[in-house]
């Protein structure tokens, strides 16, 4: 009997209700390998998910995120809300980056500006919420009264991703 089932190709299942003949997978289900006793139900891309690849009898559907969201996790297991540059997503929604931090993407957390003085350099361009500072030549290479290094970023809580 096991041999009968092993003959069932991908896209079918070994149907115990029908003397172990190979039956096609029901609608919206698939089997990606041969010899299966059940077909797996296709993933449904709903809510904040949209279909990137339709399910077939031999492969699962693949999901993407609708506009305003981005994928998180393997195979886009979750969608997280986009924020603007200069913001990060917290449990209470999108919040502006604290002074001394920046985020140049629509996702992720605000990160501290580069501390130019650690590399013995000076600040050439000040940082903003959206952009990191640009470090220039070391202060020794500059005339007296030149821009000094940026202060270290203030302590802050890391960003949170909603469930």
């Amino acid at each position: 009997l096991q041999d009968l089932c092993s003959n069932c190709p991908a896209g079918t299942f070994c149907d115990n209700n029908r003397s172990q003949i190979c039956s096609p997978c029901p609608p919206n289900s698939f089997s990606s390998a041969g010899g299966q006793r059940t077909c797996d139900i296709c993933r449904q891309c709903k809510g904040v998910f949209k279909t990137r690849k339709e399910c077939s009898s031999t492969s699962n559907a693949e999901c993407d995120c609708i506009s305003g969201y981005h994928c998180l996790g393997a195979e886009c297991s979750m969608c997280e809300q986009d924020c603007k540059q200069g913001q990060e997503l917290t449990k209470k929604g999108c919040k502006d980056c604290c002074f001394g931090t920046f985020n140049d993407q629509k996702r992720g957390i605000c990160r501290p500006w580069t501390n130019c003085s650690l590399d013995g350099k000076s600040v050439l361009v000040n940082g903003t919420k959206e952009r990191d500072v640009v470090c220039g030549p070391s202060p020794a290479d500059l005339s007296p009264g030149a821009s000094s290094a940026t202060p270290p970023a203030p302590a802050r809580e890391p960003g949170h991703s909603p469930q």
Epitope: R43, Q44, K46, G73, A74, S77
Partner: antibody, heavy 118, light 112 residues
Framework: QVQLQESGPGLVKPSETLSLTCTVS????????WSWIRQPPGKGLEWIGY???????NYNPSLKSRVTISVDTSKNQFSLKLSSVTAADTAVYYC????????????WGQGTLVTVSS | EIVMTQSPLSLPVTPGEPASISCRSS???????????LDWYLQKPGQSPQLLIY???NRASGVPDRFSGSGSGTDFTLKISRVEAEDVGVYYC?????????FGQGTKLEIK
């Protein structure tokens, strides 16, 4: 054929944390959502939450403050922790393979009864 | 959350006769992809629930063809064309459109 098996203490004291593990055999834990569902004696079914094999989670809002679900892909296991339990948490706890992240529970464990009592 | 309501709660049936269970949701389960996100489960005595029907009307692989699901939007029906002794247990409908998924109270099918 995928099989799921719940394990953990059958008796938990009030205010303590309930801990259960689900071991998946006959298939990989990868590429699916994995849910916990419970059923108080003589009552209906309540979804607790799910985890994706990569670690993404989603919990029932009614239990969210007390629930943690985690996954160990190396052992093909996922786990449930429910804190500050009361007698109302006495139930048969099932683990299940969730095909869509909150829908179509195609494979279930046999369930394990957890009683909350001092 | 979406509330699911089943009727009847108890259903005595003679073997060989048909049976029908109704399930109503507090909001439409018809999604823009054209599918109704509703499942039916059977929990036989002392066992775990088993999936019978998904997406409103699709029989899970291996489920006998005497089981069928129908309906759309907020009103759904599970039909058993000829009840057999092995069909006894509690039948649950479940909405799978929104998190958290929610179940009906259950319908207990028993043999007369």
């Amino acid at each position: 054929q995928v099989q799921l098996q719940e394990s953990g203490p059958g008796l938990v004291k009030p205010s303590e944390t309930l801990s259960l593990t689900c071991t998946v055999s006959g298939g990989s834990i990868s590429s699916y959502y994995w849910s916990w569902i419970r059923q108080p004696p003589g009552k209906g079914l309540e979804w607790i939450g799910y985890i994706y094999y990569s670690g993404s989670t989603n919990y029932n809002p009614s239990l969210k403050s007390r629930v943690t679900i985690s996954v160990d892909t190396s052992k093909n296991q996922f786990s449930l922790k429910l804190s500050s339990v009361t007698a109302a948490d006495t139930a048969v706890y099932y683990c299940a393979r969730d095909q869509s992240g909150g829908g179509s529970f195609q494979h279930w464990g046999q369930g394990t009864l957890v009683t909350v009592s001092s | 959350e979406i509330v699911m309501t089943q009727s009847p709660l108890s259903l005595p049936v003679t073997p060989g006769e048909p049976a029908s269970i109704s399930c109503r949701s507090s909001q439409s389960l018809l999604y823009s992809n054209g599918y109704n996100h509703l499942d039916w489960y059977l929990q036989k005595p002392g066992q775990s629930p088993q999936l019978l029907i998904y997406l409103g009307s699709n029989r899970a692989s291996g489920v006998p063809d005497r089981f069928s699901g129908s309906g759309s939007g907020t009103d759904f029906t599970l039909k058993i064309s000829r009840v057999e002794a092995e069909d006894v247990g509690v039948y649950y409908c479940m909405q799978a459109l929104q998190t958290p998924p929610t179940f009906g109270q259950g319908t207990k099918l028993e043999i007369k």
